[in-house]
Structure formats: structure tokens, C-alpha cells
């Protein structure tokens, strides 16, 4: 039994890190493997993660962590019974994938303006709380070509657009994701999408 692709891990910079790897053949990850992780400092405890299968030869482990601080560094040991298959380390602050934003809402009652709001996925004391920027994806359910991305580079979790920039009389969906430049994070997963019917008053044309 050998590791084909070494574990790579990402942290939500709050409470969970996710590690994924591939074995060289079909593996029952939960019965055959264990990932041990330990914060590097005196008297820290070793924790055991029971991996789950992610495809025939892929494994994934969710590592529970206390509030992450930038200095945190973990040792990782992947075991198959008594055999050490791989040894490595992981610094959560250097491999951040933010949590996905939540509660995406489209407010359509503001005159011919669409207001999209969502919630910052971090509590105010978390470092990422004041460092997230967002991308909002809006697309038409009727026309796959009608697909647009708005970059929200300010901190407020909201976006205003004129309803007239979208077609009237059809349904749209929106979703949002986050990243933090300060930690050079990857993008979060997309939030669940929300749907609305776009309608606005056409301007009166004089002839």
C-alpha cells in the first residue's frame, strides 16, 4: 500500500482543515488508514482523524482545530496499521480556503435597483472577517450565455446593480464566493444560489 498523491490540506482559518490524498489502488480509507495530527508545541496532544473515501483510491480527512492563529503548525502522519506511509507538516495560515458566504438575498423592491446582500461567514474577532472580498455570479436560467461575474472589492457584503442591466421578464439566479488577498487564499465554495424574477419598468419612449 502506497501513497500516490501526497496529502494536501486547506484550512477555513477557524475550526476545520480538510486534507485529501490518493492511494495507489482501491482503498477502504476508514478501515485501513489513520491520519494523526499534532500542533507543534510542547505538551500538545496527538489527534486521530478517520478518513472517508473520496472516489475509489481517494481519501479525505476533516481535522478539527481550535481557533487558528498564524503561528500554528501541525505535523501530519499517515498510517496504515503499524506502517507509516507518509509524514509531513501543515501550516493552516498558509493554505486557507475561506468559508462560503451565507444568507444570500436579492432585494427587488428598491426602484429598478437590485440589492444583493449576504453574510460574512466569520465572526468579528476572526482575522478574515475584515479581509474578505467577494465575487457575485449572476446567470439566466433561460440563456446559458447570459452569465456574469461582479467583483466586490469593498468589505461590505452587498452589491447594487440596475435591474435594467439584466433582461426583464425572466428568472435569474445568483451565488457568491469569497477570498482574502492578505493570506493569498483560494476561493471559497460558492454559496447556495438564490432565484428571483427580474422585472422593471421600461423607460417611456417619446416619438
Amino acid at each position: 500500500m502506497k501513497v500516490l498523491q501526497e496529502p494536501t490540506c486547506v484550512s477555513d482559518y477557524m475550526s476545520i482543515s480538510t486534507c485529501e490524498w490518493k492511494m495507489n489502488g482501491p482503498t477502504n480509507c476508514s478501515t485501513e488508514l489513520r491520519l494523526l495530527y499534532q500542533l507543534v508545541f510542547l505538551l500538545s496532544e496527538a489527534h486521530t482523524c478517520i478518513p472517508e473515501n473520496n472516489g475509489r483510491a481517494g481519501c479525505v480527512c476533516h481535522l478539527l482545530m481550535d481557533d487558528v492563529v498564524s503561528a500554528d503548525n501541525y505535523t501530519l502522519d499517515l498510517w496504515a496499521g503499524q506502517q507509516l506511509l507518509w509524514k509531513g507538516s501543515f501550516k493552516p495560515s498558509e493554505h486557507v480556503k475561506p468559508r462560503a458566504p451565507g444568507n444570500l438575498t436579492v432585494h427587488t423592491n428598491v426602484s429598478d435597483t437590485l440589492l444583493l446582500t449576504w453574510s460574512n461567514p466569520y465572526p468579528p474577532d476572526n482575522y478574515l472577517y475584515n479581509h474578505l472580498t467577494y465575487a457575485v455570479n449572476i446567470w439566466s436560467e433561460n440563456d446559458p450565455a447570459d452569465f456574469r461575474i461582479y467583483n466586490v472589492t469593498y468589505l461590505e457584503p452587498s452589491l447594487r446593480i440596475a435591474a435594467s442591466t439584466l433582461k426583464s421578464g425572466i428568472s435569474y439566479r445568483a451565488r457568491v464566493r469569497a477570498w482574502a488577498q492578505c493570506y493569498n487564499t483560494t476561493w471559497s465554495e460558492w454559496s447556495p444560489s438564490t432565484k428571483w424574477h427580474n422585472s422593471y419598468r421600461e423607460p417611456f419612449e417619446q416619438h
Epitope: 475550526s15 508545541f41 476533516h62 482545530m65 481550535d66 487558528v68 468559508r99 468579528p124 454559496s191
Partner: antibody, heavy 115, light 107 residues
Framework: QVQLVESGGGLVQPGGSLRLSCVAS????????MNWVRQAPGKGLEWVSY????????YYADSVKGRFTISRDNAKNSLYLQMNSLRDEDTAVYYC????????WGQGTLVTVSS | DIQMTQSPSAMSASVGDRVTITCRAS??????LAWFQQKPGKVPTRLIY???SLQSGVPSRFSGSGSGTEFTLTISSLQPEDFATYYC?????????FGQGTKVEIK
């Protein structure tokens, strides 16, 4: 091994105050965020409060906000819950529980609010 | 605040039965969900975290699934020591909230 021992519970009249303590051993307390969780007699679990190891930030359940204060003394390996303006509905066993996500619990201390 | 609704609140089952308990969140919590077991007079213990990750030392007959707002705890073959109360917990945001509990009793 990890141990959490609560104390300070007892009988108190409505409107009164109590201070609960939780003494930790078997791990580096200063490196751990901590919680208080309570359970009224015959009822379910209710999260009460949290204090971060990283920032010292605190959070409270709406039912205790403004009345309870969580604090810690890392030099004494101790977690505290100052409970003021106690009400009948605060009667419960109070547990301290360690992060991440309540991996260890104390045995609890009973607080009874009654006239 | 996020509400967690567990069902059923109580159930009777026999040794060897497959038992399923569900937990519904009032809004999306991704996979930030844990399951706890509490026996009478005892302290709760964590069974599952991150919706589906089995806590080390917990028997493999326990499993969790779900994401977003719908979650399930399954006991594949109920054992005598499994008669207890089970709670779900969301830790996606503060305040953290538990479900109201499901008591699994002997039929």
C-alpha cells in the same frame, strides 16, 4: 489525561449571583478555547458561552447576554462564569467543555435558582 | 440565530434495528454539524463531526451524512449500549445551537 472540574454551583435566590469555576489539567489550557454548556433538569443541552484562545473574544447565548460573563485565568488554568440577575430558568447543570467542538467535558456543577 | 430541529424527539427500537435520526438547520450550515450521545447521568460524548466524520474510538455502526440544512445520524445495528439521547449541534456561527434531542428507548 485531560480533566475539567467545575465548582461553584449551589442554591441561589432569583436576582442573585454565582461564580462558577472550571479547573483544567492534562493539557495546555492557554492553547485551548473554552465553552460553558448547560442542561436544565430533564431537558436538552444549551450552549451558553465561548471564549477564544486566540483573541480572547467572547460569545454568549441570547438567553444569558448581559447577565453572564465568561473569563479565564491562564496562569491558574481556570475558566470562570460570572452569573448575575439569576432567574428560575437558569437552573441547570453547568458544564465546561473544551474546543474544538466540545471534545472534552467536565462532570458539571448544579445551579439551582429558587426562592 | 440558527435553529436546529431534530426528529423524532423520541423513538422505540430493538437491538439490531437500523436507526435514523434527522436534524434540520434553519439556514445553510455547510458541514459544520456534530452529533453527541448522552446516557442518563453521564456527560455527552461526541460521535460525529463535520457532518460525516467519525470520531476516533466511536464504533463504525455510527455514521453521519448531509450538508447544508439536512443531516442524518444512522446507527446501522442498534446495540444495548446505544440506548441514549442524541443531540445535533451546529457550530457554523454563534450562538451555537443544539437540536432538542432524540431519546432512543428499548422497544
Amino acid at each position: 489525561q485531560v480533566q475539567l472540574v467545575e465548582s461553584g454551583g449551589g442554591l441561589v435566590q432569583p436576582g442573585g449571583s454565582l461564580r462558577l469555576s472550571c479547573v483544567a489539567s492534562g493539557f495546555t489550557f492557554s492553547h485551548s478555547s473554552m465553552n460553558w454548556v448547560r442542561q436544565a433538569p430533564g431537558k436538552g443541552l444549551e450552549w451558553v458561552s465561548y471564549i477564544s484562545r486566540a483573541t480572547g473574544a467572547v460569545y454568549y447565548a441570547d438567553s444569558v447576554k448581559g447577565r453572564f460573563t465568561i473569563s479565564r485565568d491562564n496562569a491558574k488554568n481556570s475558566l470562570y462564569l460570572q452569573m448575575n440577575s439569576l432567574r428560575d430558568e437558569d437552573t441547570a447543570v453547568y458544564y465546561c467543555a473544551r474546543e474544538p467542538v466540545f471534545d472534552y467535558w467536565g462532570q458539571g456543577t448544579l445551579v439551582t435558582v429558587s426562592s | 440565530d440558527i435553529q436546529m430541529t431534530q426528529s423524532p424527539s423520541a423513538m422505540s427500537a430493538s437491538v439490531g434495528d437500523r436507526v435514523t435520526i434527522t436534524c434540520r438547520a434553519s439556514q445553510d450550515i455547510s458541514n459544520y454539524l456534530a452529533w453527541f450521545q448522552q446516557k442518563p447521568g453521564k456527560v455527552p460524548t461526541r460521535l460525529i463531526y463535520a457532518a460525516s466524520s467519525l470520531q476516533s474510538g466511536v464504533p463504525s455502526r455510527f455514521s453521519g451524512s448531509g450538508s447544508g440544512t439536512e443531516f442524518t445520524l444512522t446507527i446501522s445495528s442498534l446495540q444495548p449500549e446505544d440506548f441514549a439521547t442524541y443531540y445535533c449541534l451546529q457550530w457554523s456561527s454563534y450562538p451555537r445551537t443544539f437540536g432538542q434531542g432524540t431519546k432512543v428507548e428499548i422497544k
